[in-house]
């Protein structure tokens, strides 16, 4: 019998070689082949050579294989179908030659950091290009004008932070554009000439309304039917559209659409759509999502995500890898809404993993002073400042959702002096105190010592606990240790204050499972002022696995945050699981995200 | 004209072994894919294994292990051996022709009949 | 699997009547890359080998006569005798063949009334 078991689809002969352990392409293959499958082995390396004489091949499946390299040096006539999504590559060779008959090319979930011109020359029958969740920075000038026949163009979550003017030009055939997560701010004016789209995908990207986007609103509003929020599993044909997903980053997420471009100049031109309109802005509400994650059972598999499920508005976010191979949990999380989305409880089943959540914040410089200095925020009236960002995402062509959070805030009462910009949170008064743990770190030394880390943990779920005291320690490897003390205060009206006390030190690496708070309060921001001279990046991380129960009903809030500190309006922040727990790649300054 | 001739087939013991044969005349075998497949008395068709032009076979689960097709071209010739026979495996046994690489099967063989029982 | 299920399993007609049958697949047999539906037809008749009539769900056999024909997509497929002869009384199958293992229905009989 042959290594690999065979079968015939559609007159093709399929071979499949899937998980077999395999290193090279197996002896036995029959000549004969049309659809092979050797997803889930271990190849490392392949090269097209190695299949020419497999003149009937139609279909290549090389995902998951571990792949760093990959060379065309053998031409494949009849292939129109390659799959090399979930490897390691961090380019790709010219493939037209090789491949003249490709219709169908995926190579998300890989490491490409770039693509070269002429990466896609020859490729005169390519229908479907998936490059999704790879680490993309820009995109080449006239990529896409050899692939006159494109429908499906796949470019969410890279790092794209602008797009080539002529991208899309001569792709009259293209019907579905996903550019969600990205870090785009703007759309090139006349970006989408007269290509009418059925299925665009803007979600999630850092859009930046000023009289730049005027263009790019205009095109939302013409085309509002055609603009869908991407959500897992659920065919795009079945969900209604949501231009309202495209919010303004600068502008507390509204919607791009309704931008009103006051004070913008006007100007004609059919294409150029500056035909400006005020259009009120949405309000923002809050919706409570509950829900627990799923992964394959028989793949360990997780990626940076692509999209939302359709429980969750796709909000505005980046992309950070787990620390962790998951566990099972359930978790609910308070969820960013504005009218128009249609947010529902959904319960599904879950492998959350031990997060770390790293919030890049840049210390303001000064050179007056080197104490901390709090600042309680003031709420406009009837305004009650809360959490408002968590969020949900999953990937395209993939199974796991997977849950996160982000900013936390402090109670009335309590005082926390913290030597960085960040907001925290311990419960109100609650007869269910959930424990957190936060910990935040100096990235490098500073001859202005702060401590490095601190560690705010409340007790054990209990219905009677809530935290009441903490310590913050500098670590051992600080040179001039400066320790600062944290207090969490017990709230006036907490019915049965328990003390307890928590020590924090530098975190070793912990299983513990820590939960997120399920009650909130007003915000105090503490901002720690420094000398010019002495920047200080910080990194607030905060690690949890979740479960959260009975979380209160959650009204429409607003966040308050003095103006010096307006760069904390921050996009939210996802938590992915992915193949490697690196995190260094993320301690960069390409991390700038969160900046508009 | 197309021609299939079945032979190889009678009553064996369950356990036992059977060699089954197909002679092919009237077309270029070894262009062709062949297949075997079965019809229990009074019941429908069921296939039970394919071998194309280039030689390479496959079966269903209910066979796999047990079964092996194998062709020789210069014989214009079939076969079929069955191993482990059980007493589900009575049936008449056809052997067919598939058109080109198309997996529908455009002449029959008259069948022979294999009766495994103790 | 392919699951193929016929209807009826047997039915009773006279000459010149208008027959059809009809035959389910669990999934589709649409390849969307030629927008082919993969089904065949077999006419077997007792003590004989079966014999193909249609294939690619309505294309005729050579030699088959212009009554019989074969239409439907996806997962619901007819044979229709437009008018029945007396050589047309047997059993017929329906097959798929999309994807292996080949499949076929549990055969429609049809009896002289």
């Known amino acids: 019998q042959h290594t690999c078991s065979i079968s015939k689809v559609t007159s093709l002969l399929e071979v499949n070689c899937e998980n077999k352990k395999l290193t090279a392409l197996p002896a036995d293959l029959p000549a004969d082949t049309g659809i092979l499958h050797l997803g889930e082995n271990q190849l490392g390396t392949f090269s097209t050579a190695s299949l020419v004489h497999f003149t009937h091949l139609t279909y290549l499946y090389l995902d998951r294989c571990e792949l760093t390299s990959l060379q065309t040096n053998g031409k494949l006539i009849k292939l129109e179908n390659l799959d090399l999504s979930h490897n390691n590559l961090k380019s790709l060779p010219s493939l037209g030659w090789a491949l003249p008959a490709l219709t169908t090319l995926d190579v998300s979930f890989n490491k490409l950091g770039s693509l070269s011109p002429g990466v896609l020359d020859g490729l005169s029958q390519l229908q479907e290009l998936y490059l999704q969740n790879n680490d993309l920075k820009s995109l080449p000038p006239g990529l896409l004008l050899p692939t006159t026949k494109l429908k499906k163009l796949n470019l969410a979550n890279n790092k794209l932070r602008e797009l080539p003017s002529g991208l899309l030009d001569g792709l009259e055939d293209l019907d579905t554009l996903y550019l969600q997560r990205n870090w785009l701010r703007t759309i090139p004016k006349g970006f989408f000439g007269t290509l009418l789209l059925p299925f665009v995908f803007l979600h999630a990207n850092s859009w930046y309304c000023d009289c730049e986007i005027l263009y790019f609103r205009h095109w939302l509003q013409e085309n509002a039917n055609n603009v869908y929020l991407w959500k897992q599993g659920v065919d795009v044909k079945d969900t209604t559209p949501n231009v309202a997903s495209v919010r303004c980053a600068n502008l507390d997420n509204a919607p791009v659409y309704s931008y009103p471009g006051k004070g913008c100049p006007t100007s004609s031109g059919d294409t150029d759509y500056d035909d400006y309109d005020d259009i009120p802005d949405v309000p923002a509400t809050r919706t409570e999502v509950k829900f627990s994650t799923n992964t394959k059972v028989h793949t360990t598999h997780w990626s940076l995500l692509a999209a939302a499920p359709s429980t969750s508005q796709d909000s505005q976010m980046i992309s950070l890898p787990p620390t962790h191979k998951p566990t099972k949990k359930q978790s609910t999380f308070i969820h960013t809404q504005s009218p128009g989305f249609t947010t529902l409880p959904e319960t599904m089943e879950s492998n959350p993993t031990f997060y770390s959540l790293k919030l890049n914040t840049v210390l303001i410089p000064s050179p007056t002073t080197l104490e901390p200095t709090s600042t309680q925020a003031t709420p406009e009236p009837n305004i009650q400042p809360m959490l408002t960002t968590s969020t949900l995402t999953t990937p395209e062509h993939s199974t796991t959702p997977v849950p996160t959070t982000t900013i936390l805030t402090t109670p009335e009462h309590s005082t926390i002096p913290v030597p960085t910009t960040a907001i925290l949170t311990t419960p109100k008064p609650s007869t269910i105190p959930v424990p957190t743990t936060a910990t935040l770190t100096t990235l490098e030394p500073s001859t202005t010592p702060v401590p490095t880390t601190a560690t705010l943990t409340t007790p054990e779920p209990s219905t009677t606990l809530v935290p009441t005291t903490a310590t913050l320690t500098t670590p051992e490897h600080s040179t001039t240790p400066v320790p600062t003390t944290a207090t969490l205060t017990t709230p006036e009206h907490s019915t049965t204050p328990v003390p307890t006390t928590a020590t924090l030190t530098t975190p070793e690496p912990s299983t513990t499972l820590t939960n997120l708070v399920s009650t909130i309060s007003p915000v105090l921001t503490t901002t720690l002022t420094t000398p010019e001279s002495t920047p200080i990046e910080t990194i607030l991380e905060q690690f949890f696995t979740t479960e959260l129960t009975l979380l209160p009903t959650l009204e429409s809030t607003t966040t308050i945050i003095p103006e010096q500190n307006s760069f904390l309006n921050l996009p939210e922040v996802a938590l992915v699981s992915s193949d490697t727990s690196e995190s260094s790649p993320f301690l960069n300054s390409d991390f700038c995200c969160f900046l508009p | 004209q197309v021609q299939l001739v079945e032979s190889g087939g009678g009553l064996v013991k369950p356990g036992g072994s059977l060699r089954l044969s197909c002679a092919a005349s009237?077309?270029?075998?070894?262009?062709?894919?062949m297949s075997w497949i079965r019809q229990a008395p009074g019941k429908g068709l069921e296939w039970v294994s394919s071998?194309?032009?280039?030689?390479?076979?496959y079966y269903p689960d209910s066979v796999l292990g047990r079964f092996t097709i194998s062709r020789d071209n210069a014989k214009n010739s079939l076969y079929l051996q069955m191993n482990s026979l059980r007493a589900e495996d009575t049936a008449v046994y056809y052997c067919?022709?598939?058109?080109?690489?198309?997996?529908?099967?455009?002449?029959w063989g008259q069948g022979t009949l294999v009766t495994v029982s103790s | 699997d392919i699951q193929m299920t016929q209807s009826p399993s047997s039915l009773s007609a006279s000459v010149g009547d208008r027959v059809t049958i009809t035959c389910k697949s669990s999934?589709?047999?649409?390849?969307?890359?030629?927008?082919?539906?993969?089904l065949a037809w077999y006419q077997q008749k007792p003590g004989k080998a079966p014999k193909l009539l249609i294939y690619f769900t309505s294309t005729r056999e050579s030699g088959v006569p212009s009554r019989f024909s074969g239409s439907g997509s996806g997962t619901d497929f007819t044979l229709t005798i437009s008018s029945l002869q007396p050589e047309d009384f047997a059993t017929y199958y329906c097959q798929q063949h999309y994807s292996s293992p080949w499949t076929f229905g549990q055969g429609t009989k049809v009896e002289i009334k």
């Open positions: 009237g077309f270029t075998f070894s262009s062709f894919a």
């Open positions: 071998i194309t032009s280039a030689g390479t076979p």
């Open positions: 999934q589709s047999l649409l390849n969307s890359r030629n927008q082919k539906n993969y």
């Open positions: 067919a022709r598939s058109r080109g690489y198309e997996d529908y099967f455009d002449y």
